[in-house]
Interface confidence: medium
Amino acid sequence: WELTILHTNDVHSRLEQTSEDSSKCVNASRCMGGVARLFTKVQQIRRAEPNVLLLDAGDQYQGTIWFTVYKGAEVAHFMNALRYDAMALGNHEFDNGVEGLIEPLLKEAKFPILSANIKAKGPLASQISGLYLPYKVLPVGDEVVGIVGYTSKETPFLSNPGTNLVFEDEITALQPEVDKLKTLNVNKIIALGHSGFETDKLIAQKVRGVDVVVGGHSNTFLYTGNPPSKEVPAGKYPFIVTSDDGRKVPVVQAYAFGKYLGYLKIEFDERGNVISSHGNPILLNSSIPEDPSIKADINKWRIKLDNYSTQELGKTIVYLDGSSQSCRFRECNMGNLICDAMINNNLRHADEMFWNHVSMCILNGGGIRSPIDERNNGTITWENLAAVLPFGGTFDLVQLKGSTLKKAFEHSVHRYGQSTGEFLQVGGIHVVYDLSRKPGDRVVKLDVLCTKCRVPSYDPLKMDEIYKVILPNFLANGGDGFQMIKDELLRHDSGDQDINVVSTYISKMKVIYPAVEGRIKFS
């Protein structure tokens, strides 16, 4: 019996087609992805093949103005239209709190939404009961397939799930649910979840009875043969893991942003054992037409977005200096504003010992593309912010050793004075440079804001300590020459859309007046 698994993950609000780098579509003839194009390909496969499942491994939420405006209603509407069979909860599904998950998505989805390792407690338990499930048994043709879900246990540090959801260890939580499916005589089981490729592989290895793992979170691109676009494969598709009980378990992921549709064909024997698995992600490029019906729907929903982008978010009573001549040479108040917003967006009260789990932000000055003039009645709109942060990136959470951070700050000024983009703006960091010293030895003081303290204060950076830092995904991926971050990071979790983070902060503050306050000094 043959099953076709179509899968997406980390779509992050890319409802419309995008450029090849998943930013805003500029030249339509070369654009990719989007739900209208995805629908065309999915329907083509559904018509051609008998046993098809369309699955999503989480993080539909967060990433473009679509999410900012519609807050998840767009996810439910278009996933319903595409007739998804199941979805696993990702960490970003909690970005607007539990209510922001329940109302727009859980109550509106016409497909099961899954996670076996999230347990509700207190008053939330009855409110959320039945709205998400640990597993679902789906009829596929004349057979039955069990889908069991999982979500990153780091979610409380990455999003806003509140205090009434407990995120258990994935493997510990999955095993009893898989065992339960076995007692129901379900012998074909897919683990669908959002914890990253390393955890996906562990699940394949450790959870007895899981036949296939469909993952997300790490934006992993797997491919067999010559890849069709710019993404470099992290391994073959499917990636085969040998389980502890000797089975070959295929593990897949489909990069991110709806650029690819994962396509995996699995052959099962009559006892539900995987006999063979093969496939590849399908690049959703312009050779695949956009479905006219879905496209018309997108255009209808789009109208509200255009109206939103000119509405006032808040006011500034000072000039927001985002000019190259400031932000690439010295501390600029636009950099301070953005870093403050980044930290504010990551406030998660961990426990009594920590005021927060992260206190530091770094931001490449070259990523700040425009100032905002306060003389326009002080008004700040989404449109204004899109000029400042036009790349559609995310502000991510990483863990780095102090020694890596020191290298990053040396890199920040290694060719100072040439208006290059790597000059770092900061938050929760005090840095002093001596430009008279040779490149690679110019950082003379580097103090960082404590997290394990009741009154935050600045302490010298420790080379062997591990720190959490918020930074643009561009830097996490080694951009602007920050190869040391990419090579040495210990953990990387993708975060919220950059403009959304700043716009939310401005809306919350209502009136802003960021200053230049001595975060970056030259001796």
């Epitope: 329907q43 018509r47 239209a81 069979d85 016409k110 789906l138 009829p139 043709g141 039955v144 129901l184």
Partner: antibody, heavy 121, light 107 residues
Framework: QVQLVQSGAEVKKPGASVKVSCKAS????????INWVRQATGQGLEWIGW????????KYNEKFKGRVTLTVNTSISTAYMELSSLRSEDTAVYYC??????????????WGQGTTVTVSS | DIQMTQSPSSLSASVGDRVTITCRAS??????LAWYQQKPGKAPKLLLY???TLASGVPSRFSGSGSGTDYTLTISSLQPEDFATYYC?????????FGGGTELEIK
């Protein structure tokens, strides 16, 4: 309110075709399957097939394959069922029904009033 | 195809009685089962789905149970408006077949 209104009764000769319409109102027509079910006089219910109005994707009961065609006109929120090569045993009341798909839990939650099709020479 | 067998095919009962109708599938339908009520000359009306979930607006005297191949519809205390024909339907693999019906009449 949500409703499905079907076309009126039909009398057809054996070998002919019949086309029954089902007009939806009160909800987004393209978001739900339309199913067709028939019931011969004094008999039980028999599922014919379904169509997804957004893209016209269909699934038929093998028993009716080749004789039944399900179509939609989304601009007027109307579904159609055409049955060809009619025979006397096709005499029945034909119902359209909306299939709710909430979170994968399926059922027919809204039904048309039924259209009586009589096949007689 | 999965066949649905309902029993009894007809049943006489009085107002206030507790009534049970059973539905047996020829294969496991994994709780993908709905119950409908139909009155003469009318379209069927949804009562329960997922074997045991009460549809919106349906009185709580109706309940469903069962799993695998055997399912039950129970009316805890018959009311005059409950005299009708009842059908089960599975939503496992197509074709989605109905049971033959149970006609519930006044004793």
């Amino acid at each position: 309110q949500v409703q499905l209104v079907q076309s009126g009764a039909e009398v057809k000769k054996p070998g002919a075709s019949v086309k029954v319409s089902c007009k939806a109102s009160g909800y987004t027509f393209t978001s739900y399957d339309i199913n067709w079910v028939r019931q011969a006089t004094g008999q039980g219910l028999e599922w014919i097939g379904w169509i997804y109005p957004r893209d016209g994707f269909t699934k038929y009961n093998e028993k009716f394959k080749g004789r039944v065609t399900l179509t939609v006109n989304t601009s007027i929120s109307t579904a159609y069922m055409e049955l060809s090569s009619l025979r006397s045993e096709d005499t029945a009341v034909y119902y359209c029904a909306r299939k709710e798909g909430y979170r994968g839990d399926w059922y027919f939650d809204v039904w048309g009033q039924g259209t009586t099709v009589t096949v007689s020479s | 195809d999965i066949q649905m067998t309902q029993s009894p095919s007809s049943l006489s009962a009085s107002v206030g009685d507790r009534v049970t109708i059973t539905c047996r599938a020829s294969g496991n339908v994994h709780n993908y089962l709905a119950w409908y009520q139909q009155k003469p000359g009318k379209a069927p009306k949804l009562l329960l789905y997922n074997a045991k979930t009460l549809a919106s607006g349906v009185p709580s005297r109706f309940s469903g149970s069962g799993s695998g191949t055997d399912y039950t519809l129970t009316i805890s205390s018959l009311q005059p408006e409950d005299f009708a024909t009842y059908y089960c339907q599975h939503f496992w693999s197509t074709p989605w077949t109905f049971g033959g019906g149970t006609e519930l009449e006044i004793k």
